[in-house]
Interface confidence: low
C-alpha cells in the first residue's frame, strides 16, 4: 500500500511548511483567536512577503473580510502580532491606502480587498488559523496528498469544541459586503 504524507488536516491548506484554515463562519477578533487555539493553531501571524501574498490572494479571491492575528489593542498605534512580535516596517506597505485610520476604535486588522484594513474588533468576520505542518518521516515523500475521506481529529487537548471548523464545508464562498470608513 502506498503511504502518503498528509502535512495538514482535512480542509486545511498547505503553504511553505505551514497549514492554514480559512473559516466558513464568522466571529469577532477575540473569538477568532479562541477558535484557532481550540484546534491547536494561532490566528495567523504573517512572517514573510510570500506568506502575505498567498493569504491576501485567498482572501481577495473569495471577496471576504478576514481577521488576521494583528492588533494595536495593547498600545494605540503600535501594531503587534498575537505572538508578541512587532509589525516589521516593510509590512506596513500592505495597509490599504489611508489605513490604518482608527476611525471609531478600529484596533484589529483584517484582509480587505488587496490589502489590510483596521476595523472594530467586536465585528464578526471570517478568520484564518495557522499551524506548523506535520513533518514526514524520511521514507515518506512530503507532498499534498488527496484529502482523506474523513477529517483528521483535532489535536489532543484542543478541546475539539469548534464543530464549524471540521464540518464538511461544501457551500460556495458567498460575497460578503461590508463598508469601511
Amino acid at each position: 500500500t502506498e503511504r502518503l504524507c498528509h502535512p495538514c488536516p482535512w480542509e486545511w491548506t498547505f503553504f511553505q511548511g505551514n497549514c492554514y484554515f480559512m473559516s466558513n463562519s464568522q466571529r469577532n477578533w477575540h473569538d477568532s483567536i479562541t477558535a484557532c487555539k481550540e484546534v491547536g493553531a494561532q490566528l495567523v501571524v504573517i512572517k514573510s512577503a510570500e506568506e502575505q501574498n498567498f493569504l491576501q490572494l485567498q482572501s481577495s479571491r473569495s471577496n471576504r473580510f478576514t481577521w488576521m492575528g494583528l492588533s494595536d489593542l495593547n498600545q494605540e498605534g503600535t501594531w503587534q502580532w498575537v505572538d508578541g512580535s512587532p509589525l516589521l516596517p516593510s509590512f506596513k506597505q500592505y495597509w490599504n491606502r489611508g489605513e490604518p485610520n482608527n476611525v471609531g476604535e478600529e484596533d484589529c486588522a483584517e484582509f480587505s480587498g488587496n490589502g489590510w484594513n483596521d476595523d472594530k474588533c467586536n465585528l464578526a468576520k471570517f478568520w484564518i488559523c495557522k499551524k506548523s505542518a506535520a513533518s514526514c518521516s524520511r521514507d515518506e515523500e512530503q507532498f499534498l496528498s488527496p484529502a482523506p475521506a474523513t477529517p483528521n481529529p483535532p489535536p489532543a487537548g484542543s478541546g475539539g469544541g469548534l464543530n464549524d471548523i471540521f464540518e464538511a464545508q461544501k457551500i460556495e464562498w458567498h460575497e460578503h459586503h461590508h463598508h469601511h470608513h
Partner: antibody, heavy 122, light 106 residues
C-alpha cells in the same frame, strides 16, 4: 515639484554629535504611507541605510548604529532631523535624505536630496 | 539583517552592449527589491521598484527581473548616459543596499 534638501555642518570633530536636517517640499509627512530616511555613503563606498521615520511617527534604525542615532520629524515645518552621537573619522560620508512614497508597491526610495558631505576630523 | 551581494563589482562594456547585473539576497525577499543608478557626485536615482516595475521617466532599455533571492538588472542596449554605478536594495525587512556595480567604458 518634490524636493529634499539636507543641511548641517560640513566639519565635525571626533566625539561630537552631528545634527542633520532634511527640509522637503511637494509632499507631506502626514500622508499615510510616506516616510523619510537617512542614508549615507563614505567616499568611494556603497550606500548605507541609517534610519527612517514614518508618517505615523514610527522610527527604525540601522542595527549597527541604533545606539548612536535619533530621528525625529516636525510635520509643520516639513523637516526631518537626524542626530548621530560620538562621531568618528569613519563616519565621514555624504549624508542623503530620501522619501518613501505612499502606495502599495513597497518601501523603496523614489526621491533623494543632493546630499551633504560631512567630514569628521580634529 | 539581510545581506545583498551584487556581481560583478565592475563591468566593462561598450555602447550598444546588453548588460546584466546580478543581485543576491541572503534570504528570500519576495519581490521587494529596487535598483538605483548613481553618477559621480550625484544622488542615486530610482530605476526599478518591486523587482520589475519601471519608475516613471526611466528609459525602457532598463528592466528588472527575479524573485526570492536572485535578481537581475538588464540594460538592453547600453547608452553613453548609462555609464554609472548601480545599486540594488531590499525593502522586505528594513533596508539594505548591495555593494554596487560600476559599469565603465571598455
Amino acid at each position: 515639484q518634490v524636493t529634499l534638501r539636507e543641511s548641517g555642518p560640513a566639519l565635525v570633530k571626533p566625539t561630537q554629535t552631528l545634527t542633520l536636517t532634511c527640509t522637503f517640499s511637494g509632499f507631506s509627512l502626514s500622508t499615510s504611507g510616506v516616510s523619510v530616511s537617512w542614508i549615507r555613503q563614505p567616499p568611494g563606498k556603497a550606500l548605507e541605510w541609517l534610519a527612517l521615520i514614518d508618517w505615523d511617527d514610527d522610527k527604525y534604525y540601522s542595527t549597527s548604529l541604533k545606539t548612536r542615532l535619533t530621528i525625529s520629524k516636525d510635520t509643520s515645518k516639513n523637516q526631518v532631523v537626524l542626530t548621530m552621537t560620538n562621531m568618528d573619522p569613519v563616519d565621514t560620508a555624504t549624508y542623503y535624505c530620501a522619501r518613501t512614497p505612499s502606495g502599495s508597491y513597497g518601501r523603496y526610495f523614489d526621491l533623494w536630496g543632493r546630499g551633504t558631505l560631512v567630514t569628521v576630523s580634529s | 539583517d539581510i545581506q545583498m551581494t551584487q556581481s560583478p563589482s565592475t563591468l566593462s562594456a561598450s555602447v550598444g552592449d546588453r548588460v546584466t547585473i546580478t543581485c543576491r539576497a541572503s534570504q528570500s525577499i519576495s519581490n521587494w527589491l529596487a535598483w538605483y543608478q548613481q553618477k559621480p557626485g550625484k544622488a542615486p536615482k530610482l530605476l526599478i521598484y518591486k523587482a520589475s516595475s519601471l519608475e516613471s521617466g526611466v528609459p525602457s532599455r532598463f528592466s528588472g527581473s527575479g524573485s526570492g533571492t536572485e535578481f537581475t538588472l538588464t540594460i538592453s542596449s547600453l547608452q553613453p548616459d548609462d555609464f554609472a554605478t548601480y545599486y540594488c536594495q531590499q525593502y522586505n525587512s528594513y533596508w539594505t543596499f548591495g555593494q554596487g556595480t560600476k559599469v565603465e567604458i571598455k
